[in-house]
């Protein structure tokens, strides 16, 4: 029954991890706009992987596409690819745990099998959740230095009283989406490879004792007994409920309350 | 096609207070900024804040600060903007003007003079 | 605040010749993540209010003649009106469409000689 729920849940919390994977990858607010000098921006910008996007405070907003593969930074380059990595692997793994849930019967296949197939998947989970985290990290690391080299020269003299403010990018929410995500998935992972040792079937193999009763023989032959009694081959109505992300993206915000500027 | 009505003229005294009305149509109202820009006589254009109507929020110009008051009221598709503790200086033709792409402004209403005189 | 200082004060020139507004503001108006200037022109006939001509700096509003153009980038920015008709007697003003609070130019006056 353990291994049953730990599997199971082991399968819920990476299925969430990805489906917030894949969220992070797809938002366009890995960098926004510093505000910390200016909380109310007419003019507020947000960068993401794959497009950068200006929201004017009269609502109007507009993105444009890297359009390009030659002309961007190497670094950002990497953190896609660590994201679509984390991405692929962690669909693979969905697909290979599907099989190897314990309460789904495919055929006749071996406990050992699922065993194996449980700790494939746990790897790939494992695998792609540290490529999730890498690819956030390494893109809030770039933020961190990029921030404090504009911020030491934060406004450039033209011409003595003219002044040029130079936009800074903060930390953005698809960073901390990306960040609990590939936490979830790690941590699925590591519940499947823990519910692996459980289904990987024991290889002490019990003799048959017959007992002689007076008047006729019964033969008691002990078998194996599994933890999960219950959870084998009868799947009837029973439903497998799989968890999933949403995020809300390109949420059109306003100047708060009473703002004076 | 668009439309943005205003009230009619005022005098008032200094110290009162006043509030101008402006009436939007042919548009979706509360998708919309409605920003209030006013003009002394012979003077340029000065901004004194925005509204949303769609949730009510403001973004006022300091120089009001505590002095203006912006409400939106969507049954009527009408925004208002409300100046207080008058003084000589407020004498001017006020615009509601609504807010477009490009942080421009697009149509204007027709202006209401207010007069602050003693 | 951002200062936009405009020039000439007035303006006269004579019916189809090229007109020329300068606007200077005290701060870069170029957005880095479009690389557009928020600046934007208005022109007001007497006893009118205002009327967009110009916002993103060169964008002309729809309906706007296309012989009034704009030009310009960072904290320098001009309005061209290629060949002056009557009509285009008014006051320009431009605007400072990127920080808060939104400020204008004091207007120039543009008369027929």
């Known amino acids: 029954m353990a291994v049953t729920a730990c599997q199971g849940l082991g399968f819920v919390v990476s299925l969430i991890g990805i489906a917030g994977i894949i969220a992070a990858t797809c938002m366009d607010q890995w960098s926004t706009q510093d505000l910390y000098n200016n909380p109310v921006t007419a003019v507020f910008n947000y960068q993401g992987l794959w497009r950068s996007c200006v929201r004017e405070s009269s609502g109007f907003t507009e993105c444009r596409g890297y359009f390009t593969l030659l002309g961007l930074p190497a670094m950002l380059q990497a953190v896609r690819a660590l994201m679509i990595v984390g991405i692929v692997l962690g669909a693979i793994g969905l697909l290979v745990s599907i099989f190897a849930l314990k309460c789904i019967r495919i055929g006749s296949m071996e406990d050992s099998a699922k065993a194996n197939m449980t700790l494939t998947s746990g790897i790939m989970f494992i695998v792609s959740g540290l490529c999730a985290i890498a690819g956030v990290s390494v893109f809030a690391n770039m933020l961190v230095t990029n921030f404090w080299m504009s911020t030491a020269n934060m406004y450039t003299g033209m011409g003595g009283m003219v002044q040029t403010v130079q936009t800074r990018y903060t930390f953005g929410a698809a960073l901390f989406v990306g960040w609990v995500a590939g936490g979830l998935t790690l941590i699925g992972g590591v519940m499947m490879c823990i519910a692996c040792r459980g289904l990987a079937p024991e290889e002490t193999n019990y003799k048959a004792v017959s007992y002689h009763a007076s008047g006729h023989s019964v033969a008691y032959k002990p078998g194996g007994f599994k933890a999960s009694t219950g959870f084998g081959s009868n799947t009837k109505n029973k439903k497998i409920y799989d968890g999933g992300a949403r995020t809300e993206d390109e949420v059109q915000s306003y100047p708060s309350k009473h703002d004076y500027v | 096609q668009v439309q943005l009505v205003q009230s009619g003229a005022e005098v008032k005294k200094p110290g009162a207070s006043v509030k101008v009305s402006c009436k939007a149509s042919g548009y979706a109202f509360s998708s919309y900024w409605m920003n209030w820009v006013r003009q002394a006589p012979g003077q340029g254009l000065e901004w004194i804040g925005q509204i949303y109507p769609g949730n009510g929020d403001t973004t006022y110009n300091g120089k009001f600060k505590g002095r203006v008051t912006m409400t939106a009221d969507k049954s009527t598709s009408t925004v208002y903007m409300e100046l207080s503790s008058l003084r000589s200086e407020d004498t001017a033709v006020y615009y509601c003007?609504?807010?477009?792409?490009?942080?421009?402004?697009?149509?204007w209403g027709q202006g209401t003079l207010v007069t602050v005189s003693s | 605040d951002i200062v936009m200082t405009q020039s000439p004060d007035s303006l006269a020139v004579s019916l189809g010749e090229r007109a020329t507004i300068s606007c200077k503001s005290s701060?870069?108006?170029?957005?880095?993540?479009?690389?557009?200037?928020?600046l934007t022109w208005y022109q007001q006939k007497p006893g009118q209010p205002p009327k967009l001509l110009i916002y993103?700096?060169?964008t002309r509003e729809s309906g706007v003649p296309d012989r009034f153009s704009g030009s310009g980038s960072g904290i320098d920015f001009t309005l061209t009106i290629s060949s002056v008709q009557a009509e285009d007697v008014a006051v320009y003003y431009c605007q400072n469409a990127y920080s808060y609070p939104f400020t204008f130019g004091q207007g120039t006056k543009l008369e027929i000689k």
């Open positions: 003007a609504r807010f477009v792409k490009g942080n421009a402004m697009d149509y």
């Open positions: 701060q870069s108006l170029l957005n880095s993540g479009n690389q557009k200037n928020y």
């Open positions: 993103w700096a060169s």
